[in-house]
């Protein structure tokens, strides 16, 4: 039987045009669900803001590699945060849609903060 998690599905509809300072970032999520219009990176800042970024951009690829490297130096308990823990504030250009989705996003966190603009999140049953 498929393993499903009844959690909101995070999707990005547009990407930040600004490069976020690396020092403000805590973690990231990979968005790969086919229910989203595009694959995306959601950066999570130390202030728990979420920002959509284009995974094709070189700076985004560099940042997520740095976050992956830093993750290995952090405590094991901080390696993976649940999606719900990362939904404390609305992401920039992100909509949260209530769907049963087992792997809507993959979260990676590090010990490596924030100014980002949140938009209204939408939760649909």
């Amino acid at each position: 039987q498929p393993d499903a998690v009844n959690a909101p599905l995070t999707c990005c509809y547009s990407f930040t045009s600004k490069m976020i300072p690396m020092s403000r970032l805590e973690s990231y999520k990979r968005i790969t669900s086919s229910r989203c219009p595009k694959e995306a990176v959601v950066f999570v800042t130390k202030l728990k803001r979420e920002v959509c970024a284009d995974p094709k951009k070189e700076w985004v690829q560099t940042y997520i590699k740095n976050l992956d490297r830093n993750q290995m130096r952090s405590e094991p308990t901080t390696l993976f945060k649940t999606a719900s823990a990362l939904r404390s504030s609305a992401p920039l250009n992100v909509k949260l849609t209530r769907k049963s989705e087992a792997n809507a996003s993959t979260t990676f966190s590090t010990t490596t903060s924030s100014t980002s603009v949140g938009v209204t999140s939408v939760t649909v049953n």
């Epitope: 219009p37 595009k38 995974p55 992956d68 993750q71």
Partner: antibody
């Protein structure tokens, strides 16, 4: 629903070239990377390379450089793999797949290429 | 290039068994590991990405673990439909590379 449609089989003479197609539906190929993977009979998987259809930028495994050309036509939402100077070593199933992060969550059903002498 | 090694190319298993398939990289791949299942005549199917994240629709009897260079795919209670070849793949750096595959066969 994401679907990558590949033709079933191609029979081509040694020394010739072939162009395999991978039309996509349920996604805009400009938003992802399109990859090609080779699987020889009874063997494992080999990554050939990928294209960013938004700008045509490609990246290859060096061992396929000169053998493979990857292109994309965004108007028809299709990725292509061209193989040149075919030999029996090129007899394999060729898969297209999507994935911007380097892993492949959607695959075509594969095109079986047979190179005859 | 990063080489990926799956120590067993095949093994015989019984239905209901707990199965563990290992994969080793020649350098640290920082959890950027995917696992695929392939049945004869079919395309590979992504099971796990990021070493541990189960894809949508994949049964919970599958799990992934590991870090650094060493990774494991586990199946808690093998079902008939799990008989297939399993491949690991690193996506830390291009060229992306696959392990040689581990084929599960019923005893």
């Amino acid at each position: 629903e994401v679907q990558l449609q590949q033709s079933g089989a191609e029979l081509v003479k040694a020394g010739a070239s072939v162009k395999l197609s991978c039309p996509a539906s349920g996604l805009n190929i400009k938003d992802t990377y399109m990859h090609w993977v080779k699987q020889r009979p009874e063997q494992g998987l080999e990554w050939i390379g990928r294209i960013d259809p938004a700008n045509g930028n490609t990246k290859f495994d060096p061992k396929f450089q000169g053998k493979a050309t990857i292109t994309a036509d965004t108007s028809s939402n299709t990725a292509y793999l061209q193989l040149s100077s075919l030999t029996s070593e090129d007899t394999a199933v060729y898969y297209c797949a999507r994935g911007v992060f380097g892993f492949f969550d959607y695959w075509g059903q594969g095109t079986t290429l047979t190179v005859s002498s | 290039d990063i080489q990926m090694t799956q120590s067993s190319s095949s093994f015989s298993v019984s239905l209901g068994d707990r199965v563990t398939i290992t994969c080793k990289a020649t350098e640290d791949i920082y959890n950027r590991l995917a696992w695929y299942q392939q049945k004869p005549g079919s395309a590979p199917r992504l099971l796990i990405s990021g070493a541990t994240s189960l894809e949508t629709g994949v049964p919970s009897r599958f799990s992934g673990s590991g870090s650094g260079k060493d990774y494991t795919l586990s199946i808690t209670s093998l079902q008939t439909e799990d008989v297939a070849t399993y491949y690991c793949q690193q996506f830390w750096s291009a060229p992306y590379t696959f392990g040689g595959g581990t084929k599960l066969e019923i005893k």
